[in-house]
């Protein structure tokens, strides 16, 4: 190989090993004879070398830096080569170092031609291996701008005062050319400023200076998104640091197209704007730190660009200034994630503060759209708290939970609503009474309606749920021991229209002792499926919990348990299963942890089942599945 | 009123059997545990063998597994205990006791024996 | 299986004395314990179950307490009927078992 440097060229060459690997042989540069690991040609210098091994590759590496001085002279702009050129070269990894000096008064632009830059953060790397390296100068200080790819926004970055620009190729790289030019432009004004250019939906993802170290104190980058113009906008910020300031605060500003507000100023943990149409700056301003803890500023933000949809033209009102104790969350639903790009879905406050997920409060109006692709990965999520703090005021009190018409003109599906229903402990109790029968939810008989309700107990400490519930059933009220919560789940768009099957009334009861009873009117028609709360999981320890069971005059109901034995084991107490006859008050006892279940036994009267657990083995717990026919009384069986 | 009465005790020889029976009323059989408890002459109680209400489960003291089982006949209102190779040391009194089931500080239990016949001896000699 | 060892196993007491008889067993039972009382050539009588509740018709002078190992019956002021054997069971599954008897007898 020769090299050789013109005198006036400013370029030295360096060549040395790399990253030490665990190669048996070593290998050395060849000069004239001499073995040797290292070789510096400075300007003026002709230097002929081999190598002695047959892949130098995997051993050296070679740094051509060019010094440009624009401070006594004038500047050499435009388009920047790779010189020596590349086919001179050995081919060895390869880093160009430009080092440009400049006056501070003076502006240098560099100008990335397409396929554009694309800013990587700790821990990544380029596809190809081929990356920059871009670094700024506060003084005597390198500020490090970034690293980058190819293949992304970045079209520009200004600086003053100088630029460091590094380049490197890996050794099977063909690429000869730098792929920038430089430009002189005014005093910017600040630490640099960036320009990403989108040409179409996708998302950026941008770091402040030296990150993820600090930011240098009390300086100002800007970067500045040239957007199409159908196209939105949104920022989110993926990772930020505040420092310890002592004069100034740290924020964001942005210059909006069409704000009367321009800048807007955004503190760092504020929702950053969404839903931006056209080209618009965002800028980092630091602050006096506090010298003795001064702490760190970093930032890493993420650009979104898309299309918008309808909807994001049209504002929706969400009046909860009568609700009490509520608030609605619009979310997206949990989906498996792609690793094509997915346009952002966001839901807006008042059109600007844009974010993947928003929640409402009561006691106010909300305005809000939608920034989103497809309004079906959104969902909603409402809860609200109808609580009794003095028993004496609520006693025989009536709630309607139904869920208030505004929710449906929201263009977002209804997931969960829950209310969250609360009574002072152990002086009141609650009853559920469904507009319409319900049904449980079994294996046996699964509910195939729209919507369910699910029953479960809102004590912290309780694991108890007690069950999914369903109109068009037989379950004619619900009542419970203490603080539920009800959860209206919907299962499809079809919720909709039938809503008005929705519709349970909450009352405040005397306060009673099991857990929860099942007022039960079995239809005549078929079998009613009843299972113990907490099914698979076991009745909780100590439980109890009691059926009600209506049977008409006209009619025999025939009880029927799923198994033969229930499987329980008793660490403490034991499990009772209690059939009652309401008329006679005659009772059956049967220890569920010992006995056989009976066998299907036919009533003519209304009757009670209880069951009373014990504190279960840990994997041997009770679950009880039985169910209910009801067939015509004839004359020999009275 | 509720009550119990045991029969089929008397005077049986070593290795020999006997079969006690306990006829229950003024109540419902079905829904409580019954036990079998002795008494040696002039010592204390012993408790030999229980059974649940729908018989489903059984139990036994030590000194008599094996040898005793203890069954019940619902529909008769009838508790049972076959004794088989009989011991002198089996010489006793045997009541038939029934089991109350209570709630105590919410946990559902057997709480002890409330309702006893009066016993019938059981002499194992030859 | 659970040992229960009742104290005394005599006692000596007057008409109107606080007695106090004492039942330990071998192993924790937590509150599963009974007191019965039998008269000779009588049936037990169950007189407390769960270590302290009183059986229906059982006078009030009798009481129970104790948790885990350490159990105790007390007859506040004695009776002429209240002369007779008192024994312990544990009710902590099965196999039951009783202490060996207290017999209380007239001073």
């Known amino acids: 190989f020769e090299i050789a440097l013109p005198r006036e060229s400013n370029i030295t060459v360096l060549i040395k090993l790399g990253t030490p690997t665990l190669l048996a042989k070593p290998c050395y540069i060849v000069i004239s004879k001499r073995h040797t690991t290292m070789l510096s040609i400075k300007p003026g210098e002709r230097i002929l070398f081999t190598f002695s091994c047959q892949s130098p590759e995997n051993h050296f590496v070679i740094e051509i830096q060019k010094n440009i001085d624009c401070m006594s002279g004038p500047c050499p702009f435009g388009e920047v080569q790779l010189q020596p050129s590349t086919s001179l070269l050995p081919t060895l990894n390869r880093t160009f170092i430009w080092d440009v000096k400049a006056h501070k008064s003076i502006g240098l632009e560099l100008q990335f031609s397409i396929p554009r830059l694309r800013q990587f953060g700790p821990g990544e790397s380029c596809p190809d291996g081929v990356t920059y390296s871009i670094s700024g100068r506060i003084d005597a200080t390198v500020v490090r701008i970034g690293t980058f790819c190819s293949n992304g926004t970045v079209s520009r970055i200004k600086m003053q005062e100088g630029v460091k620009m590094a380049l490197h190729l890996p050794w099977f790289h063909p690429r000869n050319v730098s792929g920038f030019s430089i430009a002189n432009r005014s005093s910017i004004k600040r630490l640099c400023i960036i320009e990403s250019v989108f040409e179409g939906e996708g998302s950026a993802t941008l770091m402040s200076a030296n990150y993820p170290e600090g930011f240098p104190e009390d300086e100002l980058m800007t970067w500045q998104f040239v957007i199409p113009a159908h196209l939105r906008a949104s920022v989110s910020f993926l990772n930020f640091n505040l420092s310890n300031c002592e004069r100034k605060e740290e924020r964001v500003e942005y210059y909006i197209p069409g704000s009367t507000t321009n800048p807007e100023v955004f503190k760092l943990e504020d929702k950053q704007p969404g839903n931006m149409a056209g080209n618009f700056n965002l800028s980092l301003q630091g602050c006096d730190q506090d010298a003795q803890n001064p702490g760190i500023l970093r930032l890493q933000f993420q650009v979104l660009v898309q299309h918008p949809q309808n909807e994001s033209n049209k504002i929706y009102v969400v009046d909860l200034s009568n609700e009490r104790a509520t608030s609605l969350t619009i979310e997206p639903r949990p989906v498996k994630q792609s690793r094509k790009f997915v346009p952002g879905c966001f839901v807006c406050l008042e059109s600007r503060t844009c974010s993947t997920n928003l929640t409402l409060t009561s006691g106010s109006k909300h305005k809000i759209s939608f920034l989103c692709d497809n309004l079906t990965r959104l969902w909603m999520n409402v809860e609200k708290n109808i609580s009794c703090t003095d028993h004496r005021y609520c006693q025989r009190k009536s709630y309607s939970l139904q869920v208030p018409s505004d929710i449906f003109h929201l263009p977002v599906e209804l997931h969960d609503f829950s209310w969250k229903l609360l009574v002072p402990k152990d002086r009141l109790s609650l009853v559920l009474v469904p507009a319409q029968k319900l049904q449980q939810h079994t294996h046996e008989k699964p509910c195939n309606t729209s919507f369910s309700y699910l029953v479960a107990s809102a004590i912290p400490s309780q694991d108890l749920y007690f069950g999914s519930f369903c109109p068009g059933g037989s379950i004619e009220q619900i009542q419970v021991k203490q603080n539920i919560s009800v959860t209206l789940r919907t299962f499809a768009p079809s919720f909709r229209q039938e809503a008005s099957r929705q519709g349970l009334t909450v009352s405040f009861i005397p306060y009673f002792k099991e857990e929860g009873v099942f007022t039960v009117t079995p239809d005549t028609k078929s079998k009613v499926y009843l299972r113990t709360p907490n099914w698979d999981r076991g009745l909780p320890s100590l439980t109890s919990v009691s059926w009600n069971i209506s049977v008409p005059r006209d009619q025999v109901a025939c009880l029927t348990f799923f198994k033969e034995r229930t499987g329980v084991v008793c660490q403490t107490g034991r499990a009772f299963m209690i059939i009652q006859e309401q008329r006679t008050r005659a009772e059956e006892i049967f220890s569920l942890d010992e006995d056989a279940l009976p066998k299907p036994r036919f009533h003519h009267h209304s009757f009670w089942v209880n069951i009373s657990n014990c504190s279960p083995a840990s994997g041997k717990q009770l679950d009880l599945l039985f169910w209910v026919t009801l067939t015509p009384r004839t004359v020999d069986l009275t | 009123e509720v009550q119990l009465l045991e029969s089929g005790g008397g005077l049986v020889q070593p290795g020999g059997s006997l079969r006690l029976s306990c006829a229950a009323s003024?109540?419902?059989?079905?829904?409580?545990?019954m036990n079998w408890v002795r008494q040696a002459p002039g010592k204390g109680l012993e408790w030999v063998s229980a059974i649940s209400g729908g018989g489903g489960s059984t139990y036994y003291a030590d000194s008599v597994k094996g040898r005793f089982t203890i069954s019940r006949d619902n529909s008769k209102n009838t508790l049972y205990l076959q004794m088989n190779s009989l011991r002198a040391e089996d010489t006793a009194v045997y009541y038939c006791?029934?089991?109350?089931?209570?709630?105590?500080?919410?946990?559902?239990?057997?709480?002890?024996?409330?309702?006893w016949g009066q016993g019938t001896t059981v002499t194992v000699s030859s | 299986d659970i040992q229960l060892t009742q104290s005394p196993s005599f006692l000596s007491a007057s008409v109107g004395d606080r007695v106090t008889i004492t039942c330990r067993a071998s192993?924790?039972?937590?509150?599963?314990l009974a007191w019965y009382q039998q008269k000779p050539g009588k049936a037990p009588k169950l007189l407390i179950y769960a270590a302290s509740t009183l059986q229906g018709g059982v006078p009030s002078r009798f009481s129970g307490s104790g948790s885990g190992t350490e159990f105790t019956l007390t007859i506040s002021s004695l009776q002429p009927e209240d002369f007779a054997t008192y024994y312990c069971?544990?009710?902590?599954?099965?196999?039951?078992?009783f202490g060996q008897g207290t017999k209380v007898e007239i001073k």
């Open positions: 003024g109540f419902t059989f079905s829904n409580y545990a």
């Open positions: 069971q544990h009710l902590n599954r099965f196999p039951r078992t």
């Open positions: 006791a029934k089991e109350s089931i209570t709630m105590v500080r919410g946990v559902m239990d057997y709480y002890g024996m409330d309702v």
């Open positions: 192993q924790g039972i937590s509150s599963y």
